[in-house]
């Protein structure tokens, strides 16, 4: 009688994360008697994946009812694939032994390979915030995926961008892969309502990619621009003066009046008027009564944005042209913009 | 669901002999093999040996090999240890144990006293 | 035979504590063959960890296992009151099939 053979019949399968594994196996013979085992790797070191007489294997279940007496078909089911279960596995024949059952013959082999899937790209921007012309750094990462083949690309308001780092590790074999990829931006004015996308392309996800964003709203700080006028008086001895506080962005903005370097109001911008690019106005006004003023007055609006430096702008208030009242000590009346004090 | 239920306990005099059945239900009894465990009193654990059912075939602790026969009946789906010539240090629970060692019986007291 | 030695005999530790079973084998075990068990007091034994780090079904995760060749480690990370019972690896890479002497592991 011929020899006993063990046919493994696929030299690979191609398995998706999560799914089951068939892995076919069948002998020629029923004899010797003895037990069919898998494993996974050869060598010593070699993973026990089955066993059918001994041993835990709640993953594997067999093809055929292996208690059967002609039986000679030993495929198994794996469940729940992931990628660690990549790997060559062996359909092994046990010959019966004392004390332990002896190695007899084994299949060629079948390699399982594992697609998986890449996890959500994770888009993450600068700690700090950077102002327009700045270039800042984007970094987009995905993990758990194979095979290694991966494709990214980077967008800014759905255009391409083309100045970037990606690195896909390890760089040898594994059972599953990250990719890591660092994108440089040039900020401009508009950037408020942008948006930076990161776009992961792979074979398991069937040509629909994965995206990972970042709004520029949380990397973008756009400086105010001030303006100091003078309006028309709007009575006797007392002038309006308004700072208006231009484009800027994020909202967190104090504003502080000076008087000739002397603290005359502090206040926080609340009420303001978004432009359609995202960014921000805002105007607050000064009433100032002139008559309590010997000589002219330099006026100064002083601006803290969202906890950069101060910027201010001044403006030079005449007083000469105007009657001074006697006995007056008060140096100024200060109203918000939203406020009328009438004396 | 996967039950091995074990016979009563048995109090032995020493040089007896005494079979501990356990019989199986809720799996294909013949899918795997069937051991067999012992715990002194205050003791650790003790393999006494195996049997497969598809063939009867049957390993044994050299510890025990001349004294312990490991038997089954497909039919009742039974697997039985007989343990001869008792001794007092014998007195142990006896378990039986599928061979995926997840299922175990609740365990048999055997007492080997004069 | 395969000789499976544990350690210590008896672990005395507070709820909340990590602990830490150690089972040494008097020749290499491929860690496939390496089981843990816990048993307590009037109980069968029941499975805890197969192929040396793999938990068994209802087995909670604060349990872990690691090692191979010689040197095996069962892990409580953070011990709960009924984590209190007798822990036993067992091998079954050879014949005869052996267990450890048991690391009991009691409330201090």
């Known amino acids: 009688e011929e020899e006993l053979q063990v046919i493994q019949p696929d030299k690979s399968v191609l398995v998706a994360a999560g799914e089951t594994a068939t892995l076919r196996c069948t002998a020629t013979s029923l004899i010797p008697v003895g037990p069919i085992q898998w494993f996974r790797g050869a060598g010593p070191g070699r993973e026990l994946i089955y066993n059918q007489k001994e041993g835990h294997f709640p993953r594997v279940t067999t093809v055929s009812d292996l208690t059967k007496r002609n039986n000679m078909d030993f495929s198994i089911r794996i469940g729940n694939i992931t990628p660690a279960d990549a790997g060559t596995y062996y359909c092994v024949k046990f010959r019966k032994g004392s004390p332990d059952d002896v190695e007899f013959k084994s299949g060629a082999g079948t390699e399982l390979s594992v697609r998986a899937k890449p996890s959500a790209p994770v888009v993450s921007g600068p700690a700090a915030r950077a102002t327009p012309q700045h270039t800042v750094s984007f970094t987009c990462e995905s993990h758990g995926f194979s095979p290694r083949d991966i494709t990214l690309k980077w967008f800014k308001n759905g255009n391409e961008l083309s100045d970037f780092q990606t690195n896909v590790d390890p760089v040898g074999e594994s059972v599953s892969y990250s990719i890591h990829s660092t994108a440089k931006v040039v900020l401009t004015r508009e950037d408020v309502h942008s948006q930076v996308i990161c776009e992961v392309a792979h074979v398991t996800l069937q040509g629909d990619p994965l995206r990972g964003t970042a709004n520029l709203s949380e990397t973008i700080r756009v400086p105010p621009t001030l303006e100091v006028t003078q309006q028309p008086v709007r009575a006797e001895n007392q002038v309006n003066v308004t700072c208006q506080v231009r484009k800027f962005y994020p909202q967190r903005l104090q504003l502080t009046w000076l008087e000739n370097g002397n603290v005359s109001r502090t206040e926080t911008a609340s009420t303001v008027t978004e432009n359609k690019d995202g960014t921000y106005n805002w105007m607050s006004w000064l009433l100032v009564n002139v008559s309590a003023h010997r000589d002219d007055v330099k006026l100064t609006c002083q601006v803290e944005h969202d906890g950069q430096p101060a910027v201010s702008k001044s403006h030079d208030l005449k007083v000469s042209a105007h009657p001074k009242e006697q006995g007056s000590n008060t140096a100024a009346e200060n109203t918000g913009s939203n406020e009328r004090n009438i004396y | 669901q996967v039950q091995l239920v074990q016979s009563g306990a048995e109090v032995k005099k020493p040089g007896a002999s005494v079979k501990v059945s356990c019989k199986a239900s809720g799996f294909n009894f013949e899918d795997t093999y069937m051991h067999w465990v012992r715990q002194a009193p205050g003791q650790g654990l003790e393999w006494m040996g195996r049997?497969?059912?598809?063939?009867?075939?049957?390993k044994y602790n050299p510890k025990f090999q001349d004294r312990v026969t490991i038997t089954v009946d497909t039919s009742t789906n039974t697997a039985y240890m007989e343990l001869s010539s008792l001794r007092s240090e014998d007195t142990a629970v006896y378990y039986c144990v599928r061979g995926n060692y997840v299922n175990w019986g609740q365990g048999t007291t055997v007492t080997v006293s004069s | 035979e395969i000789v499976l030695t544990q350690s210590p005999g008896t672990l005395s530790l507070s709820p909340g504590e990590r602990a830490t079973l150690s089972c040494r084998a008097s020749s290499s075990v491929s860690s496939s063959y390496l089981y843990w068990y816990q048993q307590k007091p009037g109980q069968a034994p029941r499975l805890l960890i197969y192929s040396t780090s793999n938990l068994a079904s209802g087995i909670p995760d604060r349990f872990s296992g690691s090692g191979s060749g010689t040197d095996f480690t069962l892990t409580i990370s953070r011990l709960e009151p009924e984590d209190f019972a007798v822990y036993y690896c067992h091998q079954w890479y050879s014949y005869p099939r052996t267990f450890g002497g048991g690391t009991k592991v009691e409330i201090k």
């Open positions: 049997i497969d059912p598809a063939d009867g075939d049957t």
